[in-house]
């Protein structure tokens, strides 16, 4: 998977009046990494692992970047002409990626009230607009404003892309990101499905990096893809990931099935709990994390695009 840095900024308005603050989160390799703390007026790391990435360096550069971007986005929202009465949001998502072959990609997306209306591939300088008439109007409105702003030239976007990649490379220099390995905790549960059948679920949690193999095996052989159901690999808010896989088996045949997990060159197998036992937890060198994600968008009542 490529390394990525994603900036997620939102500004709000009420009856056309744009609020003076902004909401911002930055994700590094898909993990919550920074957020802008309005009360402290600066970018703050999300949890211990994010603090470790920069060590004792300050977050002044990140604060400056987010503040500047927030100001730009507020100005953009103020120039959206068709603002109706009530609460509205303008969200900008900027992503830059470095792939294994050292190639780079960068994109930018704008959402109004949760609806995507404008995207840009920075390398190709190609803008994309969805077909809806609302998106077309909004996109024209915003693009005209961006063109009027001398800063929003091609060089501006390329500089923004270069800055994003420079930041990403700076973070990747940290051994915390490149060499970080947190083994998963694997957890097998069973539940009655229908007469004679049970559903067995294997959950892996608190692991890093994201890549993991989790599959059910019968007599040591992996089950076919269509007999298993997989959950997405999702951030758990602690700088680590979680996922699951489930399958349906005949009651009484539990001992033939194991959950196979492979992560960062290590692997383990986990049996189905038998009889009345509902949960078997296999603590596989599990490292505990106590840094929960403080979700600043909880109270915002606006659609939030990951």
């Amino acid at each position: 998977e490529p390394h990525s840095l994603r900036y997620n900024l939102t500004v709000l308005s009420w009856d056309g009046s744009v609020q003076s603050g902004f909401l911002a989160e930055v994700h590094l390799d898909g993990q919550p990494f920074l957020r802008y703390d309005r009360q402290k007026c600066r970018a703050k790391p999300q949890g211990q692992w994010a603090e470790d990435v920069l060590g004792n360096k300050t977050w002044d550069r990140e604060t400056r970047d987010l503040t500047g971007n927030g100001k730009d986005l507020r100005m953009t929202l103020a120039h959206i002409k068709d603002q109706k009465e009530g609460l509205h949001s303008l969200q900008e998502i900027r992503v830059c990626e470095i792939h294994e072959d050292n190639s780079t990609r960068s994109s930018q997306h704008f959402y109004y009230d949760g609806e995507l209306f404008l995207s840009q591939n920075v390398e190709t300088e190609e803008w994309t607009v969805p077909q809806s008439s609302r998106a077309q109007t909004l996109a024209m409105n915003v693009r005209n404003f961006l063109k009027e702003d001398a800063m929003k030239t091609k060089t501006h976007y390329h500089a923004m892309h270069a800055d994003c990649l420079q930041e990403l490379r700076r973070y990747l220099e940290s051994s915390v990101v490149l060499r970080r390995r947190v083994p998963p905790m694997v957890n097998v549960t069973r539940s009655e499905a229908s007469e004679g059948n049970i559903t067995v679920t294997c959950r892996a949690s608190s692991f890093y990096p994201r890549n993991i193999t989790l599959t059910w095996r019968q007599d040591g052989v992996s089950l076919s893809h269509d007999t298993q159901q997989w959950g997405d690999v999702l951030p758990d808010g602690n700088g680590t990931y979680q996922t699951w896989v489930a399958t349906r088996i005949c009651q009484g045949e539990e001992q033939r099935f194991t959950c196979y997990m492979e992560h960062s060159g290590n692997h383990s197998t986990h049996p189905v709990p038998s009889g009345k036992v509902l949960v078997l937890q296999s603590h596989w060198q599990h490292h505990h994390h106590h840094h929960g994600l403080n979700d600043i968008f909880e109270a915002q009542k606006i659609e939030w695009h990951e």
Partner: antibody, heavy 116, light 107 residues
Framework: EVQLEESGPGLVKPSQSLSLTCTVT?????????WNWIRQFPGNKLEWMGY???????NYNPSLKSRISITRDTSKNQFFLQLNSVITEDTATYYC?????????WGQGTTLTVSS | DIVLTQTTSYLSVSLGGRVTIACKAS??????LAWYQQKPGNAPRLLIS???SLETGVPSRFSGSGSGKDYTLSITSLQTEDVATYYC?????????FGGGTKLEIK
């Protein structure tokens, strides 16, 4: 523990300038947060006047913009309020407080009377 | 500027009783509201931020609620030390403004 303390002249004549100092202990004003001036009029109405952020940027209440200036001395961990051309209606208790949105630490306040 | 209106200037409540203090904003403020308690001769003290988040050290008999334009501070089981004036303050956009205050007395 974070502590803020205001100091000032107590009495100022109309049309003169008012200068107040807020001394912060237990926290560096260059670390983070915004550092605010808030006043409370004799009828108890509270008014936010403006702030200087940890980075040195300022934000003022538009109703005072032409008369107000907030500065700081980082070596002494102090920030200052200057209000020009004062009038009797500027008579109030002046507070300094910490916060970029709401105010979690306040000074005890200093009373200022504008009178000839 | 956003105007915060605390319609009740004075409230007289019995000890042990329940109090609700209202604050209405002239615009939607997205829960960006704080509540303060001020006792005579003292500076205001922060009780609640983000409309509902109780500050450390504030007794759990205090709570905040509301959304959009309408917000409420509630005090259950009123104590003598709760006699004070209560102010709301928004931080949707600058200039930040305060409500006019609600003075709470014991009946």
């Amino acid at each position: 523990e974070v502590q803020l303390e205001e100091s000032g002249p107590g009495l100022v004549k109309p049309s003169q300038s008012l200068s107040l100092t807020c001394t912060v202990t237990g926290y560096s004003i260059t670390s983070d947060y915004a550092w605010n001036w808030i006043r409370q009029f004799p009828g108890n109405k509270l008014e936010w006047m403006g702030y200087i952020s940890y980075s040195g940027s300022t934000n003022y209440n538009p109703s005072l913009k032409s008369r107000i200036s907030i500065t700081r001395d980082t070596s002494k961990n102090q920030f200052f309020l200057q209000l020009n051309s004062v009038i009797t209606e500027d008579t109030a208790t002046y507070y300094c407080a910490r916060g970029g949105t709401y105010f979690d630490y306040w000074g005890q306040g200093t009373t200022l009377t504008v009178s000839s | 500027d956003i105007v915060l209106t605390q319609t009740t200037s004075y409230l007289s409540v019995s000890l042990g009783g329940r109090v609700t203090i209202a604050c209405k904003a002239s615009a939607h403020i997205n829960n960006w509201l704080a509540w303060y308690q001020q006792k005579p001769g003292n500076a205001p003290r922060l009780l609640i931020s983000d409309a509902t988040s109780l500050e450390t050290g504030v007794p759990s008999r205090f709570s905040g609620s509301g959304s959009g334009k309408d917000y409420t501070l509630s005090i259950t089981s009123l104590q003598t030390e709760d006699v004070a004036t209560y102010y709301c303050q928004h931080y949707w956009s600058t200039p930040w403004t305060f409500g006019g205050g609600t003075k709470l007395e014991i009946k």
